[in-house]
């Protein structure tokens, strides 16, 4: 999940004029940017979110808004300030002519402007079975803790709060920000207006069909009776939650966003701010049978993005469309024919389908996990959701071929016990956006702020790549992959882990002149090897074969091609121990894998040798996968021999801490 993605239109206006003699004109050469939804029918021209620079105070926001109004009036334009943002993002919402955009972009403090656009409910008119661990039966589903310490905010349609399933569990706030319904003959019918939100509230915390039966909920109305809302309305809703959190701090908060619109920089930014304030956001991946990275808030990295599967663990088809997929999806959850509260009457039930229902399941699971362990951070919660998911049960053939490797094969499940997971070293795999096909194109994968980057690998479908390396960016390590000339682009793959009190660094060996190959090891006392990367400046590596197996007694060593620079990720953390595991195949094979044993976690995954017929390496759960070119093109020469190298780690410190708690 990354903000750089997509089919998102960016219209940059480079504005350097001194028009109107602004006292605080932007410094020479700075450019504010204008953004709009890439999906034309969803655009709402005439309403704009003006986002100001991060440190802008409320008084400056108000002054900037007034200045815009004054300058517009001098040109004969009427404007209306609809809302001044503060608390999450500084800025304001303005109704004005698009002719004023150039003027607005020149205002002091302006970072970017985004045209408002529509967002939509993600539902269409077996579930506890899948998320319940084997030791429970769905008909006697009694969760160990019903999420009673957690408050779940639902941003959706209005709801029928007196429905027997959710009565007394949902507090309807006075927040409402919805657009007018489309069409002159539209008749508001309470049961239709409440349908989506009521069903989802039931899925999260319903008495009979809810996941987290003890969770209390608060509803905000951001979707109208047709299930349609706006980015600006959603932003104001998120700001309302942040202000409520500041006024009356409670326990853990989960925010459920069962809606999707086109990629929105501002909506993603607001989600990031709220997540960094300690709020867990869960969203629908979208029902467009498309890359979730093209939608918001699904594409926001800080949000837990949920795709939908059915009772057979197949991706959900919804008419001609279906669940979204891709690297911006964190996991899947039940989202087909989900039984929940119906707004038709206070005891009615109905089944609905969509990624909204899937997201509601995960919001319920999150509420239960947070109720059991209220101190869990967002990163810890996400890692646990991934760890306890059912693995490799989804039929990937449903996804487009180029998305299969990027889409997590995970279906959400409740932990067998809400305690006792603390000893585990948790890791997840984060894929970058595609680099693009130019020679110098690079792709960057980043871990969340409180995760540690333990290894970095790369993958290219054409096999033309120049490897990868870990490098510092903004005080944190990132994983950067390099495309090669004539390549179709690369992905960077980061292995992101929860490793408290870790001190990690990267040790690099430049290309070796000798024919023995390049080697680098962790030489600092107490540091262990968690990952190996290699990067080369040459477009074509020769077929030099380094000695694959390390000399005995040197497990802390990375080995690579003599023309490549080799990077070792070396970490010191209490009780951390790691070992290298290799699986070599002498004959060419399209895929070679090696897995870590029970109790060990995969932190590093790389290939030997790094020559051009290797497409790359990546981690899938606890298995290191190395992919090579089609066997038929390689021939059965010795050049086809490939070794998958896994680095498996565990933390004795975490295990001891866990035992002390029990």
């Amino acid at each position: 999940q990354e903000d750089e993605d997509g089919d998102y239109e960016e219209l940059v206006l480079a504005l350097r004029s001194e028009e109107d003699g602004l006292a605080e004109a932007p410094e020479h050469g700075t450019t504010a940017t204008f953004h709009r939804c890439a999906k034309d029918p969803w655009r709402l021209p005439g309403t704009y979110v003006v986002v100001l620079k991060e440190e802008t105070h409320l008084s400056q926001s108000e002054r900037t808004a007034r200045r815009l109004q004054a300058q517009a009036a001098r040109r004969g334009y009427l404007t209306k300030i609809l809302h001044v943002f503060h608390g999450l993002l500084p800025g304001f919402l303005v109704k004005m002519s698009g002719d004023l955009l150039e003027l607005a972009l020149k205002l002091p403090h302006v970072d970017y402007i985004e045209e408002d656009s529509s967002v939509f409910a993600q539902s269409i008119p077996w579930n506890l079975e899948r998320i319940t661990p084997p030791r429970y039966r769905a008909d006697e589903y009694q969760p160990p803790d019903g999420g009673s310490l957690v408050e779940v905010y639902l941003l959706d349609t209005s709801i029928q709060s007196d429905h027997r399933e959710i009565e007394g569990r949902v507090m309807v706030t006075d927040f409402e920000n919805v657009p007018e319904e489309d069409g002159t003959r539209f008749h508001r019918q309470a049961s239709k207006c409440d349908s989506h939100g009521t069903h989802l509230a039931g899925v999260v915390s319903g008495r009979d069909a809810g996941v987290a039966k003890g969770a209390s909920m608060r509803s905000l109305r951001v979707l109208n009776c047709q299930g349609k809302g706006t980015v600006s309305g959603t932003l104001i809703g998120l700001e309302f939650i942040r202000k409520s959190q500041l006024v009356q701090p409670v326990g853990p908060l989960v925010v459920l966003l069962p809606l999707a619109g086109g990629y929105s920089r501002v909506l993603n930014a607001a989600c990031q701010r709220l997540a960094r304030a300690g709020v867990v956001l869960v969203t629908a991946a979208g029902n467009f049978r498309d890359d979730a990275c093209l939608y918001s808030p699904a594409s926001a990295p800080e949000v837990i993005t949920v795709g939908a599967t059915n009772a057979q663990d197949q991706p959900v088809t919804l008419g001609t469309l279906g669940t979204n997929f891709g690297r911006c999806v964190d996991l899947f959850a039940p989202g087909e024919d989900i039984i929940g509260a119906s707004s038709d009457c206070s005891t009615c039930f109905v089944s609905q389908s969509g990624t909204s229902q899937a997201a509601a399941h995960v919001a319920g699971i999150a509420a239960m996990m947070l109720s059991a362990e209220p101190e869990l951070t967002l990163a810890e919660l996400r890692q646990r959701l991934i760890h306890f998911s059912a693995k490799d049960v989804i039929n990937e053939a449903w996804f487009p071929e180029d998305q299969r490797v990027l889409t997590p094969n995970l279906v959400a499940a409740l932990p067998p016990s809400t305690h006792g997971a603390g000893w585990q070293l948790f890791c997840r795999t984060v894929w970058s956006a595609h680099s693009g096909p130019t020679r110098m194109a690079t792709a960057v994968a980043r871990c969340a702020p409180d995760e540690e980057l333990l290894s970095c690998s790369s993958f290219s479908r054409s096999g033309k790549r120049r490897g990868e390396r870990m490098e510092a960016q903004g005080g944190k390590l990132v994983c950067r992959a390099h495309n090669a000339f004539g390549g179709e682009g690369v992905y960077a793959i980061a292995r992101c882990c929860l490793l408290p009190q870790a001190n990690c660094s990267v040790h690099t060996a430049p290309p070796a002149e000798a024919s023995m190959g390049t080697r680098v090891h962790c030489h600092q006392q107490g540091h262990v090897l968690t990952g190996c990367s290699s990067h080369w400046e040459v477009e074509d590596l020769g077929t030099h074969k380094p000695p694959v197996l390390r000399p005995r007694g040197q497990p802390n060593q990375c080995v690579g091609h003599r023309e490549a620079s080799i990077h070792a990720s070396c970490c010191h953390a209490p009780g951390l121990e790691c070992k290298v595991k290799e699986h070599g195949i002498p004959a060419p094979q399209e895929q070679v894998t090696v897995a870590c044993e029970e109790g060990w976690t995969l932190t590093g995954c790389s290939a030997l040798p790094g020559t051009s017929h290797v497409l790359g390496a990546y981690a899938v759960d606890n298995t290191c996968v190395v992919r090579s070119r089609d066997v038929s093109t390689t021939g059965s020469t010795s050049e086809g021999a490939v070794t998958a190298v896994a680095i498996c780690c565990r933390s004795r410190h975490l295990a001891q801490a866990s035992q002390e708690l029990q």
Epitope: S435, G436, P437, T438, R439, M440, A441, T442, A443, F485, G486, E537, V538, E539, D540, G542
Partner: antibody, heavy 117, light 108 residues
Framework: QVQLVQSGGGLVQPGGSLRLSCAAS????????MHWVRQSTGKGLEWVSA???????YYPGSVKGRFTITREKAKNSVYLQMNSLRAGDTAVYYC???????????WGQGTLVTVSS | DIQMTQSPATLSVSPGERAALSCRAS??????LAWYHQKPGQAPRLLIY???TRATGIPARFSGIGSGTEFTLIISSLQSEDFAFYFC??????????FGPGTKVEIK
């Protein structure tokens, strides 16, 4: 069709600065890697800098720290800011596009930079 | 950095004759080598890339061979417009991208 139109050359004193511009048409400049190459009588063709589609920049040791390559999406243009110019920087400077599978496929018309007191 | 050398520095050929221009790299550049020609007062123009692939619009009389460190550009039958400077360039090891010093093909 693809075109690269250069401007900004001229005579400058040693230690001075100059900014070369290259306006692209017929393609989206930010989807390609762009280079500056210079040609002097004594040295032949010499690669001077590059900016990748993802914004990474590259320079040879001879100009590192003195030359800066940038691009501006809105104007579909690439620039070369040259500071602390020396007599050895005197050359015709070319703006060059690199194709995805073809090396330096389109060249600007060239602009002469003369560094002399 | 990889050094590129070209020989001869000048090649005198009669129109209609065959010309062979040599380019050598100081270390292997695989087949990541390009040839350009340049007429006086004009920018260089790409002829061959990947050591042997003709660029769009380049006549069949131009061909390239070689890989590793030794490369040759062959012009099977020189036309009047072919009398110009010819440069080779390696793009395997970068930065920097390096060019040969050039061969001048002149009318005999």
């Amino acid at each position: 069709q693809v075109q690269l139109v250069q401007s900004g050359g001229g005579l400058v004193q040693p230690g001075g600065s100059l900014r070369l511009s290259c306006a692209a048409s017929g393609f989206t400049l930010s989807s390609y890697d762009m280079h500056w190459v210079r040609q002097s009588t004594g040295k032949g063709l010499e690669w001077v800098s590059a900016i990748g589609s993802t914004g990474d920049t590259y320079y040879p040791g001879s100009v590192k720290g003195r030359f800066t390559i940038t691009r501006e999406k809105a104007k579909n243009s690439v620039y070369l800011q040259m500071n602390s110019l020396r007599a050895g920087d005197t050359a015709v400077y070319y703006c060059v596009r690199e194709g995805w599978e073809v090396p330096f496929d389109y060249w600007g018309q060239g602009t002469l930079v003369t560094v002399s007191s | 950095d990889i050094q590129m050398t070209q020989s001869p520095a000048t090649l005198s050929v009669s129109p209609g004759e065959r010309a062979a221009l040599s380019c050598r790299a100081s270390q292997s550049v695989s087949s990541n080598l390009a040839w350009y020609h340049q007429k006086p007062g004009q920018a260089p123009r790409l002829l061959i890339y990947g050591a042997s692939t003709r660029a769009t619009g380049i006549p069949a009389r131009f061909s390239g061979i070689g890989s590793g460190t030794e490369f040759t550009l062959i012009i099977s039958s020189l036309q009047s417009e072919d009398f110009a400077f010819y440069f080779c360039q390696q793009y395997n090891n970068w930065p920097p991208f390096t060019f040969g010093p050039g061969t001048k093909v002149e009318i005999k």
